[in-house]
């Protein structure tokens, strides 16, 4: 008998090269075969459970950046007046959540902020739990 | 043939809203359907393997806080004279280990220390390994 | 019917007690039953996917340390003029990658640097993906 294979784990890596004041960071998924999807500049959560979240980026100017997942809830990450981020977190997310950026810039040099190495990774930690597609 | 489902991953999120000097932080599990259990203010480890550990909290006063897993072993986390914690770690834990807090306070404004956003998450990273229940 | 078991997750913990200038840190795997292997002082990657990476160590002298995975790619971690490290990261690694240290010391007191608590952990986060052995 063939040993059971793992069904694919819900995970995604998105990149962002620019962020806009009072909007967010424009995210793109470089890989076609990600198991999670981007929609309206947000990462869509289909499966309940803990997620490992990695956020990296080097910004052209100082900004304040928050990563949200649900209206009326506190942010997953909140960084005030930074020029870079390299953070790891764990959070419980659920079906219908959407992970998105909110950005405030503190300068008027440019209308957007450029990002080097901008990367957001989400990896589901509870396969076997509830999912809805 | 139905593709195999994942058995549930051992994981737990406990919350703590207060810590007592020379005791620890009083932990409660808000969810009934956690796959790990709290007993005598400790999280019980049933499965050998690596665990992803996330610890967060904002304290009402300065304290020194350690998170232990086994008598005679060094702490998983040790923070001295802090007012907040937001840490992630990886550790190898084994059946019979118990994860618990030790706290020392440096002030006597109140008889205990209150905690906002106090959260400890453990997620097993090696399903398929040895477990005993 | 017996519920399906998880095949073992690719993971490894290596220890290092000394690092050599312009070489790296000498890594050993204390456990016989790791699911990943050490070869030529590097950890061999057989499976594509995200990896959770934990790096810890307390050094006898100041050093600059980088952790690489592929020639021509930036490091997984890069720390300049430090005496300790306690970092967690997430990275996408692939078959044929090799994880290894590069070290530069800034002193000539000794020809090598001793390390207390030197530990590198890798845990695969995408079981079910491509592996080659």
């Amino acid at each position: 008998q063939v040993p059971p294979q793992y069904p694919p784990i819900q995970s995604i890596r998105v990149q962002f090269t620019r962020c806009e004041n009072e909007k967010g960071c424009i995210i793109t998924s470089p890989s076609k075969d990600e198991t999670m999807k981007v929609q309206d500049n947000s990462i869509i959560i289909n499966c309940d459970g803990f997620y490992l979240i990695s956020l990296k980026g080097y910004f052209s100017e100082e900004l304040s950046l928050s990563l949200y997942y649900r209206k009326g809830r506190g942010p997953l990450f909140s960084l005030s007046k930074v020029t870079s981020v390299d953070s790891i977190g764990v959070a419980y997310l659920a079906f219908k959540d959407k992970v998105y950026f909110n950005v405030t810039t503190h300068s008027t040099s440019y209308k957007d902020i450029q990002v080097n190495g901008g990367e957001l990774i989400l990896i589901h930690q509870n396969p076997g739990g509830f999912c809805a597609y | 043939q139905v593709p195999p489902q994942y058995p549930p991953i051992q994981s737990i999120r406990v919350q703590f809203t207060r810590c007592e000097n020379e005791k620890g932080c009083i932990i409660t599990s808000p969810s009934k359907d956690e796959t790990m259990k709290v007993q005598d203010n400790s999280i019980i480890i049933n499965c050998d393997g690596f665990y992803l550990i996330s610890l967060k909290g904002y304290f009402s006063e300065e304290l020194s806080l350690s998170l232990y897993y086994r008598k005679g072993r060094g702490p998983l986390f040790s923070l001295s004279k802090v007012t907040s914690v937001d840490s992630i770690g990886v550790a190898y834990l084994a059946f019979k280990d118990k994860v618990y807090f030790n706290v020392t306070t440096h002030s006597t404004s109140y008889k205990d220390i209150q905690v906002n956003g106090g959260e400890l998450i453990l997620i097993h990273q090696n399903p398929g390994g040895f477990c005993a229940y | 019917q017996v519920p399906p078991q998880y095949p073992p997750i690719q993971s490894i913990r290596v220890q290092f007690t000394r690092c050599e200038n312009e070489k790296g840190c000498i890594i050993t795997s204390p456990s016989k039953d790791e699911t990943m292997k050490v070869q030529d002082n590097s950890i061999i990657i057989n499976c594509d996917g995200f990896y959770l990476i934990s790096l810890k160590g307390y050094f006898s002298e100041e050093l600059s340390l980088s952790l690489y995975y592929r020639k021509g790619r930036g490091p997984l971690f890069s720390l300049s003029k430090v005496t300790s490290v306690d970092s967690i990261g997430v990275a996408y690694l692939a078959f044929k990658d090799k994880v290894y240290f590069n070290v530069t010391t800034h002193s000539t007191s000794y020809k090598d640097i001793q390390v207390n608590g030197g530990e590198l952990i890798l845990i695969h986060q995408n079981p079910g993906g491509f592996c080659a052995y």
């Epitope: 009326g72 506190g74 | 904002y58 009402s60 007012t83 907040s84 209150q114 956003g117 | -």
Partner: antibody, heavy 119, light 112 residues
């Protein structure tokens, strides 16, 4: 030493708007829920609004719901009270007070700032 | 809302006397966590309020042991032993058991 310093009080006409500020020091501000309490001339204390340590939730007394907004800037250790559609009965000294969470009292208060609403 | 009723509205006392102030809540202040969130505050003339007592009977940092609180459920008392000139002001009870947090109308303590 804990300090809470309010500012922004003024005399204005009914229907007007005002923004009060409270700058905190001497304690880990970002850890604490913060509140505003007011005291009409010669009267007692009335709790007005509260905000969670991370800004995720806000609470108001019924008399100001929909007119007042509490907010905070943890980077600047400041809590704000935006007051719109002001009425004569909003005339009071407004105190900023720290209250770590629902399990703790109002343990330190600012000196207050006077808001007068009169035609 | 929980209504807090303080009596008497005012007190005139001589130094070294031991006055008491009563506070009644319109419903029990015992919360499901087993604690009773009843506090006492003092507002001295021209100053902002200051915390004296929390959780019915616990004195806050720096508060003289001449101040003591007691009671349970809906009925509470603040006792000031050997009153001093510096104790003059308006005393308020307050409840933190349930939103909206509410205060009594105050008891003005004057020294003869």
């Amino acid at each position: 030493e804990v300090q809470l310093v309010e500012s922004g009080g003024d005399l204005l006409k009914p229907g007007g708007s005002l923004r009060l500020s409270c700058v905190a020091s001497g304690f880990p501000f970002r850890n604490y829920d913060m509140t505003w309490v007011r005291q009409a001339p010669g009267k007692g204390l009335q709790w007005v609004a509260a905000i969670h340590y991370d800004g995720s939730n806000t609470y108001y007394t019924d008399a100001v719901k929909g007119r007042f907004t509490i907010s905070r800037d943890n980077a600047r250790n400041t809590v704000f009270l935006q007051m719109n559609s002001l009425r004569a009965e909003d005339t009071a000294v407004y105190y900023c007070a720290k209250k770590f969470n629902n399990y703790r009292p109002f343990d330190y208060w600012g000196q207050g700032t006077l808001v007068t609403v009169s035609s | 809302d929980i209504v807090m009723t303080q009596t008497p509205p005012s007190l005139s006392v001589s130094p070294r006397e031991t006055p008491s102030i009563s506070c009644k809540a319109s419903q029990s202040l015992l919360r499901s966590d087993g604690n009773t969130y009843l506090e006492w505050y003092l507002q001295k003339p021209g100053q902002s309020p200051q915390l004296l007592i929390y959780l019915v009977s616990n004195r806050f940092t720096g508060v003289s042991d001449r101040f003591s609180g007691s009671g349970s459920g809906t009925d509470f008392t603040l006792r000031i032993s050997r009153v001093e000139a510096n104790d003059a002001g308006v005393y308020y009870c307050g409840q933190g058991t349930q939103l909206p947090w509410t205060f009594g109308a105050g008891t003005k303590v004057e020294l003869k």
